[in-house]
């Protein structure tokens, strides 16, 4: 049968030749009458066998890590016979493994983000080395990890890479670190190869820091004319922390007068001091609140950084601003009778200077030919007015400063002029009437109306009667209707064209007013031919005839 | 899981140099105990050993090729390169490359495989 | 240089039958150094087998390798459809080489 031990060759021998090992038949005497011969992968070309011996050698370098193990197949002839003394066989050549490769990190580049004011022993990443030297060959690739840089913050674990924090670190200090690691083989017995790494190790932020005003005094002003919602100024705290733990809420401590407020900008984390009630210079020139800050987000195990809220005060200065006059009331009704004369007074206007140097004040009417002013904002009338012109006056008046004239006010005042009764009634329209030539007596002649120009108090009342003349020796007669109307009736029985072709009539109309006005009016009455019907045949003016529907022949 | 991926030109001249690259993604070409090979198999045929390359830059090639083939390796590209001179029609074919376990031989995984055809 | 035979050429079955595949040494190679590979049309060969006899990761054990020396077998015990396709082995021994492969199609 064969003999032979395991066979192994150290890997990066740099001799020509290194003996292996020896296979031999046991039938073999020595008399080197035995062929031994070596096939498969390498032989030829890494492993060669002498012949007579059966001795193996390398030829070639070997690198374990490239190829551990070597697969061959030993014959061995009879060089009388030529026939095989062994049955063909298999056997390994193993490459053994010298320490000749360092730990590397494969992961490369490393990079960690741990929280900063981590309490020790927190972990904070795991690095790995590999050493690509056989792991059961001695301590080839044994690894112990050690720091080279990161003291005293971080500490590695020496047999896993495991990478933890030994002390407390403050980002608003310092927010990287750089750590190098160090993976050393031989469990670091001298001889070690070692490989080193950098990890870069990030603070992120946790919300330790408050938001402090660095200033403690602000000084704003404010116009007195500046609407509500008018930003005022701005006020800025400052946070050491970064992104949402430096986000912050500004809102005010004191405000007695409850005139301002503060809303935050949350794009700059600056306060805007806001106007929230009109001011006055004239009623108040100054200001006094305080302002607090606080941040947004706030986790409850981080409360003890933020138990008092920073705060600041803020003066603020109301700037006086020239205001126009102000007038006593937003407007004025007054009243005056009709025909009353020239600079009769309708009535007294009254505007002031808020202002504290109360300037003088100068009235105008704008646009009036009929009233005037005076610098006591009397107003008079320059002409006689009469109601039935107009009833109402609409008036602009517009108060000036003396000191500056730039500064106007103006209102409206509305004059009502008042009735007297200066109107007496006449004749609503123009009447034009008739009568036929055998008109008997009592005969409707004409109805007619009266009105007046004057307004009426309660209610116009009219009443109608003849002249005195026409009633003693009137053809015709009239009856008063009572209720502003009145009829005009024949007196007699018969009219003669030719003789009396046209009848004038005067009518007296009188108002219920105080006192009582009359007019005289005249009616026309035009005497006509008609026929038994009572058709008109023939009047005096055929044109009239025609005009109120009359035939004529 | 380490995957191989071939580029390069599908046409070349006869008598021109074949280039292919082998990108290795998945896994780092500098570890030990593997092989970087090329196969190749002409169209309808079967396959066909052209060569392997160890990370350090050790080669071994098919004996018939050896006279026309250069493998290379790039560890920093992750990559390993086919070079393959005075081309003919008769190296027309679908070119692998794979990995190759050093101890054992086999080829697992393999790339999808490029065409190359020679033609004027 | 070690070749390798692979019979028969082609295997015509139908899916559920058992399909035999052979390959064949010129010179002994040791069991450690002969695989098995799958090829479908269009697509890189898989590997199948290794040491002779070991699957590869994800090959359902269906498929089952044996033989030492010159003579090594691929079997797959019953047929799926996804089996038909070429076979190839390879061997290390020396100069890595391949079968000329075995086509399995339906019948």
């Known amino acids: 049968g064969w003999v032979w031990n395991q066979f192994f060759v150290p890997e990066e021998m740099n001799t020509t030749s290194h003996h292996v090992g020896r296979l031999r038949s046991d039938l073999d005497n020595g008399n080197n009458s035995f062929q031994y011969k070596l096939l498969g992968a390498g032989a030829g070309s890494t492993f060669i066998i002498d012949e007579r011996t059966g001795d193996i050698y390398a030829i070639e370098k070997l690198d374990r890590e490239e190829r551990s193990l070597y697969i061959l197949r030993a014959q061995v002839i009879d060089i009388t016979t030529g026939r095989a003394v062994e049955p063909e066989s298999e056997f390994v050549i193993k490459v053994s493994d010298i320490n000749d490769n360092e730990p590397k990190f494969l992961d490369e580049p490393y990079e960690a983000i741990v929280p900063e004011m981590s309490p020790e022993g927190t972990l904070v990443i795991q690095v790995t080395a590999s050493d690509a030297d056989d792991p059961s060959s001695g301590n080839n690739a044994r690894l112990l990890y050690s720091l080279l840089q990161g003291q005293p913050y971080f500490s590695v674990e020496p047999t896993t890479g495991v990478i933890r924090i030994s002390s407390k670190m403050d980002r608003e200090l310092q927010d990287e670190y750089w750590v190098i690691i160090q993976a050393k083989d031989m469990i670091g017995q001298p001889g070690a190869l070692s490989g080193t790494t950098s990890v870069l190790i990030k603070l992120s932020d946790v919300n330790d820091n408050k938001p402090i005003f660095k200033e403690s005094l602000y000084r704003l002003t404010v116009s007195e004319s500046a609407p509500t919602g008018t930003s005022i100024g701005t006020i800025m705290a400052y946070d050491n922390d970064i992104g949402e733990n430096a986000e912050m809420d500004y809102s005010i401590e004191e405000d007695d007068s409850q005139t301002f407020d503060i809303i935050t900008n949350h794009e700059t984390q600056e306060g805007i001091v806001i106007l929230k009630k009109k001011v006055n210079f004239e009623h108040q020139n100054h200001y006094g609140i305080r302002a607090k800050v606080k941040n947004h987000h706030v986790d409850e195990q981080l409360m003890k950084y933020h138990t008092e809220a920073s705060t600041t005060f803020i003066k603020i200065q109301v700037e006086d601003v020239d205001e126009p006059p102000l007038f006593l009331l937003p407007y004025y009704i007054f009243e005056i009778f009709e025909e009353t004369p020239q600079g009769s007074f309708v009535g007294v206007v009254s505007a002031t200077d808020p202002d504290n140097r109360k300037s003088p004040i100068r009235y105008s009417i704008t646009r009036s030919k009929v009233f005037n002013i005076d610098d006591n904002g009397t107003i008079t009338t320059t002409n006689s007015l009469d109601r039935e012109i107009s009833a109402w006056y609409n008036l602009s008046i517009t108060a000036t400063e003396k000191y500056n004239i730039e500064q106007i006010s103006s209102i409206p005042v509305y004059v009502q002029v008042l009735n007297i009764n200066d109107h007496a009634p006449e004749f609503s329209q123009y009447y034009e009437s008739y009568v036929c030539e055998n008109a008997g007596s009592g005969q409707v002649i004409q109805t007619i109306s009266a009105v007046d120009r004057d307004e009426s108090i309660e209610e116009h009342h009219f009443y109608f009667n003849l002249s005195v003349e026409d009633t003693n020796s009137s053809s015709f007669t009239i009856i008063d209707n009572q209720d502003n109307t009145a009829v005009i009736l024949t007196n007699r029985t018969g009219f003669n064209l030719q003789e009396e072709p046209i009848f004038y009539i005067s009518i007296l109309i009188a108002d219920n007013g105080i006192p009582s006005l009359t007019s005289t009016n005249t009616l026309t009455i035009h005497v006509c031919d008609c026929d038994d019907s009572g058709s008109t045949q023939t009047c005096q003016y055929q044109e009239l005839m025609l005009s109120m529907g009359f035939k004529t022949e | 899981q380490v995957q191989l991926q071939e580029s390069g030109p599908g046409l070349v001249k006869p008598s021109q140099t074949l280039s292919l690259t082998c990108t290795v993604s998945g896994g780092s070409i500098s570890s030990g105990g593997y092989y970087w090979s090329w196969i190749r198999q002409h169209p309808g045929k079967g396959l066909e050993w052209i060569g392997y390359i160890y990370y350090r830059g050790r080669t071994y090639y098919n004996p018939s090729l050896k006279s026309r083939v250069t493998i290379s390796v790039d560890t920093s590209k992750n990559q390993f390169s086919l070079k393959l001179s005075s081309v003919t029609a008769a190296d027309t074919a679908v070119y692998y490359c794979a990995r190759v376990y050093s101890n054992y031989g086999w080829f697992d995984p393999w790339g999808q495989g490029t065409l190359v055809t020679v033609s004027s | 240089e070690i070749v390798l035979t692979q019979s028969p050429g082609t295997l015509s079955l139908s899916p559920g039958e058992r399909a035999t595949l052979s390959c064949r040494a010129s010179?002994?190679?040791?069991?450690?150094?002969l695989a098995w590979y799958q090829q479908k049309p269009g697509q890189a060969p898989r590997l199948l087998i290794y040491g002779a006899s070991t699957r590869a990761t994800g090959i359902p054990d269906r498929f089952s390798g044996s033989g030492s020396g010159t003579d090594f077998t691929l079997t797959i015990s019953r047929l799926e459809p996804e089996d038909f396709a070429v076979y190839y082995c390879?061997?290390?021994?020396?100069?890595?080489?391949f079968g000329q492969g075995t086509k399995v199609e339906i019948k």
């Open positions: 010179q002994s190679v040791s069991s450690s150094y």
């Open positions: 390879q061997q290390y021994g020396s100069s890595p080489s």
